[in-house]
Amino acid sequence: ETDEEPEEPGRRGSFVEMVDNLRGKSGQGYYVEMTVGSPPQTLNILVDTGSSNFAVGAAPHPFLHRYYQRQLSSTYRDLRKGVYVPYTQGKWEGELGTDLVSIPHGPNVTVRANIAAITESDKFFINGSNWEGILGLAYAEIARPDDSLEPFFDSLVKQTHVPNLFSLQLCGAGFPLNQSEVLASVGGSMIIGGIDHSLYTGSLWYTPIRREWYYEVIIVRVEINGQDLKMDCKEYNYDKSIVDSGTTNLRLPKKVFEAAVKSIKAASSTEKFPDGFWLGEQLVCWQAGTTPWNIFPVISLYLMGEVTNQSFRITILPQQYLRPVEDVATSQDDCYKFAISQSSTGTVMGAVIMEGFYVVFDRARKRIGFAVSACHVHDEFRTAAVEGPFVTLDMEDCGYNIPQTDESTLMT
C-alpha cells in the first residue's frame, strides 16, 4: 500500500536544514554531528538503527580525535550507574548520566537525554572512521543496562513536538573514498520528524514493524535475478530480520546465505571468482571503468505488506552489494568486496540494502517505508526498485518466534 494519503501535521515535504547532514561511508558507518552539554561540545555520532543507547567516547582513546568531557558541562547530571555492553567481538563500558543534546542540522530543539559516557572499550571505535559515539535509534527493549533507560529518540519525541518518525537516505559513493574525500563528501540525510520527498523517487511502500525492539520486519520471499530461492520463508527470518544502519553488509542466515551465493555464482558464471571473494576475504578487480555489472544478478527481498496477503519487493543491484574498496596495490583498477555475508543472528539489512533506498522509520504507525533513493548508484540498464503489490499467502508463518530467555539481545 503506498502512502498517498494527506500528510499529518508536522510532516511537511521539505526539510532543507536536515538534507545532507550525514557523512561517512558504508564500511565505517554514517555519522551525524551532535552537540552535548553546556557549553555545547561537538561530536560526530554514528547513526545506528540496530541499538538503543546514546553512547559517546568520554575518555582519551587512540582512535578518537575528541571526546565528551563531562567535567566541562554545567548541565551534566550523573546517574551514578554503570553500563557494560558486550558484543560477540568487543565491548564498551561506561557511566550513565544525562545532559542537554541537540543536532545542529536537525530539528531546532534541545533535549535532556540519557548518555552513556564510554570510559573503556575494545573493538568498538574504528581507526579513521571520524565518529566518536553512537546514536542507537531502536527501541527501549534492547537498551542497556535494561529497558528502563529511555533511548534518545523517545526523549526527543516526549520533550518536543517532533513527530515520532525519522527517515534515512544513505548514499554509497559507488567508488572508494580516501580519508580527505570522506571528510568532504556527502553521505546522505537523516530527516528527523518527517519525510523529504526530494530524497526518493516513485512511491513509498510500508512493511509492519513486527516487534518494537530492533526494527524487526518479515521477509516472505527472496529472488536472485527473478528466480525464487524456494526456501521455507521462516528460514529468511531465522531468528529475526532487522533493518540496521550500523551494519555494513546484507547479512543472511547460514542456509539462506549458502543458497543465495550458489544462485549468484550461477548467474555470474561467465567469470570465475575465487572462493575467498564470496567469503569477503579476496577483492575482485577490473580495469577502471570496465566492471561488468551486467553479469551480476539483482537481488529482490519481498517484505510483508500492510494489507493481508499483500507483499512488495525491494530490489538491489550489484552496485549495492559489491562494495568499492581502495587498495594502493591495485589502485589503477576498480576493486570490490562482496558485501553479503553469513549471520548466526538472522537477516540484517545493513548499509548494502539501505544505500539503495530511502527508508522511513515510522514509529508512530509501527511500520517501515521503502522507496527508491534519489542517490542510489546504478547504471543505464538497471535501477534499484520498490514494487508491488504482490499476492503472498500465510505471511505470518514466515516470522520466527524466538524462545524467551534472559540472554543478551545485543550479542551480535
Epitope: G27, Q28, T88, Q89, I126, N127, G128, E271, K272, F273, P274, D275, G276, G280, E281, Q282, L283, V284, C285, D327, A329, T330, C335
Partner: antibody, heavy 116, light 107 residues
Framework: EVQLQQSGAELVRPGTSVKLSCKAS?????SYWIHWVKQRPGQGLEW???????????KYNQKFKDKATLTVDTSSSTTYMHLSSLTSEDSAVYYC?????????WGQRTLVTVSA | DIVMTQSQKFMSTSVGDRVSITCKAS??????VAWYQQKPGQSPKALIY???YRYSGVPDRFTGSGSGTDFTLTISNVQSEDLAEYFC?????????FGGGTKLEIK
C-alpha cells in the same frame, strides 16, 4: 604506506610453544584479512591460514589446524600466531601477509629455530 | 588441494634477454593466479594478480598471461636486479597453494 611489522627471531625448545606477532599500519586494520605463510629452505611457501580482524573468524589449512592458532587484537592492530608442540619440522621462516587481491603486502619475516 | 607445478627449478638468462617462467595448476583456477618475486633474505614481493594484472609500481617488463591451468610470467629486457626466485600462487580455492619456485640466474 601499508606496513606489516613482524616480531623478532625466536630460538625455542622442542615441545614448547611460541607466539609470533604481526603489527599492521597504514590502512584500516579491520577491512582486510591477515594470512600466515611458512617457508622452509628448499620447500617453497605453504599457506597456514587466515583471520578476519573484524570478527576474528579464522580459516586454516587442514595441515596446520592442530599446529597454529590465529588471534587478533584490534586495539593494537596486531595479529598473532601461536605455534604449539614445536618440533624441528616447525623450524622455518614465517610471514604474515595482507589480503587484497591475493597477497599484495607481506611482513618482513620471523625466523623460528627449534633446537634442544 | 590444488597443486601448482613450476617445472623449471632454475633458469639462466642474460641482461637484456626475455625469459618466460611457467606454472601449471592441477585443476582449473580461472585467472585466480598471482606471481611473487623473492630475493635472497627478503620477503616475497607481489608482481602480478588475476594472472595478467600488474600490481602498482611493478615495472612493465613483467607480464603475466594464461588462464585455466597454464600460466606464464614473462620478463622482457631482464635487468640484473631481477635475480630472484619467482613463485606462482593460486588463490582460487582453499587452501591457497604456491608453486615450488623458479630461481632466475643472470649469466
Amino acid at each position: 604506506e601499508v606496513q606489516l611489522q613482524q616480531s623478532g627471531a625466536e630460538l625455542v625448545r622442542p615441545g614448547t610453544s611460541v607466539k609470533l606477532s604481526c603489527k599492521a599500519s597504514g590502512y584500516t586494520f579491520t577491512s582486510y584479512w591477515i594470512h600466515w605463510v611458512k617457508q622452509r629452505p628448499g620447500q617453497g611457501l605453504e599457506w597456514i591460514g587466515m583471520i578476519d580482524p573484524s570478527d576474528s573468524y579464522t580459516k586454516y589449512n587442514q595441515k596446520f589446524k592442530d599446529k597454529a592458532t590465529l588471534t587478533v587484537d584490534t586495539s593494537s592492530s596486531t595479529t598473532y600466531m601461536h605455534l604449539s608442540s614445536l618440533t624441528s619440522e616447525d623450524s622455518a621462516v614465517y610471514y604474515c601477509a595482507r589480503s587484497g587481491v591475493a597477497f599484495p603486502y607481506w611482513g618482513q619475516r620471523t625466523l623460528v629455530t627449534v633446537s634442544a | 588441494d590444488i597443486v601448482m607445478t613450476q617445472s623449471q627449478k632454475f633458469m639462466s638468462t642474460s641482461v637484456g634477454d626475455r625469459v618466460s617462467i611457467t606454472c601449471k595448476a592441477s585443476q582449473n583456477v580461472g585467472t585466480n593466479v598471482a606471481w611473487y618475486q623473492q630475493k635472497p633474505g627478503q620477503s616475497p614481493k607481489a608482481l602480478i594478480y588475476s594472472a595478467s594484472y600488474r600490481y602498482s609500481g611493478v615495472p612493465d617488463r613483467f607480464t603475466g598471461s594464461g588462464s585455466g591451468t597454464d600460466f606464464t610470467l614473462t620478463i622482457s629486457n631482464v635487468q640484473s636486479e631481477d635475480l630472484a626466485e619467482y613463485f606462482c600462487q593460486q588463490y582460487n580455492s582453499y587452501p591457497y597453494t604456491f608453486g615450488g619456485g623458479t630461481k632466475l640466474e643472470i649469466k
